[in-house]
Every structure is written in structure tokens, then in C-alpha cells.
């Protein structure tokens, strides 16, 4: 495929990434499924920088991202490492809370009001961010 | 009421170590970032160090990495400040800062003078 | 690093007079600023946060406005107490940057 040069329409760039901020919610698994479509992933946030950009972007909402544990240990869906990388959990958190009587425990992160993470419930319609590479190869073949 | 009291400052030579202390009370310590901040004599403010409320991330300014160290006892409410091979330039008054909202100062403490002459 | 920049380094006014003190970054840094107020021999403390945003207890006074690179911190009316040097202070991106400080001092 061709290397992607610039973002999309109604993409906005930072930093050599792409992003795509929704206006409706969907559960983790439907906007994880909706980010793959468009050739993306949900947001993975690896620094203090992309943490704010994200934040000032989605306003006070919650938001999810692209770090679950539902297979276990927490885990980035684009494999970056999350035992070494940037986290921004807020105080008591994750706590894989069973009270909410929704069956099971949470197993999914997201955005919180004041920007810090929590996990919950993935089945809960949050807004969601979908990121992408500019500087990796586009799925769609080359204009010929 | 949030207090924040700064202690272990004095005066040190080049190239020796001091560990500041900064005791908090009147809030959850647990649940904040936590930032040194510093002030050399008739100067501006220098940003030191960050750490987070469980420790999972620590940033620091440049001049200090490899130097200095940014450490928490949520146990004992009390922050801490490592420096090693002090320089001249390093000579300030020290204050430890509480975090909200990354990396806002809401609260203050006092301040350390920490002096590093031969 | 983010570089800020702030103007004037030192003004003198007189007690009800507008004070007016911008600031301006190297990079956007959207509206991640901060104002701090700092007295002699005292901590510093936070006067208005996120460009605009009023610290509890703060007076309505003090008014903070910009957002990407340039940013001001206005005092509509001041008093005896707003004497002070003034910081400006950039939380996008570490090393957290702070400006090189405003002094206000009385005419």
C-alpha cells in the first residue's frame, strides 16, 4: 500500500497521527470495530502531550480508548507496551468494579470527565477517538 | 486545610547529596500529583519534577535527569526530593507543589533554601 | 521545550489603574496556561488556570484570556494587595515552562 501523507477529511493531525473524534457513542467493542474500518485503531496514548491534545479535543465526556484487559492484563490494541508507557489513571483506578450489576467486572478504559482514565463496563455507549499513522502504509492500493 | 511543609535544606558543597522532605496534611496525598518546583535567589520559577499519585509516571527538567530523584511514601504522606552531585547552579528555594489537573500548582509549600558553595 | 514569553518584564502603575500582561508561547499549547501571583518571600500562588479559568477565592478582578500561542492576564482595577511579580505557565508539555515573570510595582 501507499504510505498515508496527510489526514483525512475531518481528521485533525498532531504530531505524524491522524485523529477522529466521535459525536456519538458506541460500545468498545462497535467503536474498536469502526476505528479498524477506517484503516485506524482507538487512541492510544503514549505521552503527556497526546494526553492533552486528546483531552482538549473531547472536552468533559467520557471517551473511550484503546486499552482493555479483557483478556487479562491491560493491553493498547496497537501492542505498545502499557507497563512502561504513559498512564493517567485516576486515583482508586482501574478497579474492575462488579457492583454495577451489569454482569461481570470492567474490562475497558476510557476518558473521564477531568481527562483521567477509568475503567468500565465495555457494553456502555461512549463517544470514542480513533487514531491512525501518517507515516504508515494505507491499506488501499496505489493509484495506478 | 492542605499544608505542605518543605524540610532538609541547608547548605551542601558541590558535588555532595541532600534529600528534601515535604509533609503533607489536610487532603488525600494519595490521590495527587506531586511537583518540586524551584526558585534561585531574585530569579524566575524553574519546574523541577513531577511524580504521579501511585508513582507510575515521573517526569523531570533536563538539567536535574540522571541527578536528581523524585520519590513518594503515600504511608506517610511525604514527598521527596533526591539531589545528588549538586552544582552551584542548583542552589534555589525548593517547594514542593500539589498537582491537579496535570500539571497545575494549586497548593504550595513554603519552600527549602538548599545553598551549594564550597 | 515550550518557550514563554512574557511581557512587560516590569511596569509601574498606580492603585486603580488597568494592568494588563501578556504572555506568549513557542508552540500552541491550545489553552493549557496558568497564572500564578507571587509576593516577597512568599510561595506563589495560582490565580487563574486553563487561560481563563478562576481559582476559588481568586477576586473577579483578575480575568484571564488567549488560547494556542498568545495569551493575557488582565487586572480591571488594582489594589494596594495585587503589588506582586506575576507568572505565566504552560502545562501542554514537560519541562512545564514557566514565563520570566511581570513585576508590578507602585508609581
Known amino acids: 500500500g501507499s504510505e498515508r501523507t496527510c489526514c483525512p477529511v475531518n481528521w485533525v493531525e498532531h504530531e505524524r497521527s491522524c485523529y477522529w473524534f466521535s459525536r456519538s457513542g458506541k460500545a468498545w467493542a462497535d467503536a474498536d470495530n469502526y476505528c479498524r474500518l477506517e484503516d485506524a485503531h482507538l487512541v492510544v496514548v503514549t505521552s503527556w502531550e497526546e494526553q492533552k491534545f486528546v483531552q482538549h479535543h473531547i472536552g468533559p465526556v467520557n471517551t473511550w480508548m484503546g486499552l482493555h484487559d479483557q483478556n487479562g492484563p491491560w493491553k493498547w490494541v496497537d501492542g505498545t507496551d502499557y507497563e512502561t508507557g504513559f498512564k493517567n489513571w485516576r486515583p482508586e483506578q482501574p478497579d474492575d468494579w462488579y457492583g454495577h450489576g451489569l454482569g461481570g467486572g470492567e474490562d475497558c478504559a476510557h476518558f473521564t470527565d477531568d481527562g483521567r482514565w477509568n475503567d468500565d463496563v465495555c457494553q456502555r455507549p461512549y463517544r470514542w477517538v480513533c487514531e491512525t499513522e501518517l507515516d504508515k502504509a494505507s491499506q488501499e492500493p496505489p493509484l495506478l | 486545610q492542605v499544608q505542605l511543609v518543605e524540610s532538609g535544606g541547608g547548605v551542601v558543597q558541590p558535588g555532595r547529596s541532600l534529600r528534601l522532605s515535604c509533609a503533607a496534611s489536610?487532603?488525600?496525598?494519595?490521590?495527587?500529583?506531586m511537583h518540586w518546583v524551584r526558585q534561585a535567589p531574585g530569579k524566575g520559577l524553574e519546574w523541577v519534577a513531577v511524580?504521579?499519585?501511585?508513582?507510575?509516571?515521573?517526569y523531570y527538567v533536563d538539567s536535574v535527569k540522571g541527578r536528581f530523584t523524585i520519590s513518594r511514601d503515600n504511608s506517610k504522606n511525604t514527598l521527596y526530593l533526591q539531589m545528588n552531585s549538586l552544582r552551584a547552579e542548583d542552589t534555589a528555594v525548593y517547594y514542593c507543589?500539589?498537582?491537579?489537573?496535570?500539571?497545575?500548582?494549586?497548593?504550595w509549600g513554603q519552600g527549602t533554601l538548599v545553598t551549594v558553595s564550597s | 521545550d515550550i518557550q514563554m514569553t512574557q511581557s512587560p518584564s516590569s511596569l509601574s502603575v498606580s492603585v486603580g489603574d488597568r494592568v494588563t500582561i501578556t504572555c506568549r508561547a513557542s508552540?500552541?499549547?491550545?489553552?493549557?496556561l496558568n497564572w500564578y501571583q507571587q509576593k516577597p518571600g512568599r510561595a506563589p500562588k495560582l490565580l487563574i488556570f486553563?487561560?481563563?479559568s478562576f481559582q476559588s477565592g481568586v477576586p473577579s478582578r483578575f480575568s484571564g484570556s488567549g488560547s494556542g500561542t498568545d495569551f493575557t492576564l488582565t487586572i480591571s482595577s488594582l489594589q494596594p494587595e495585587d503589588f506582586a511579580t506575576y507568572y505565566c505557565?504552560?502545562?501542554?508539555?514537560?519541562?512545564?515552562?514557566f514565563g520570566g515573570g511581570t513585576k508590578v510595582e507602585i508609581k
Open positions: 505557565q504552560q502545562t501542554y508539555s514537560p519541562p512545564l515552562t
Open positions: 507543589a500539589r498537582d491537579e489537573q496535570l500539571g497545575t500548582f494549586d497548593y
Open positions: 489536610g487532603f488525600t496525598f494519595s490521590s495527587y500529583g
Open positions: 486553563a487561560a481563563s
Open positions: 508552540q500552541s499549547i491550545f489553552r493549557y
Open positions: 511524580i504521579w499519585h501511585d508513582g507510575s509516571n515521573k
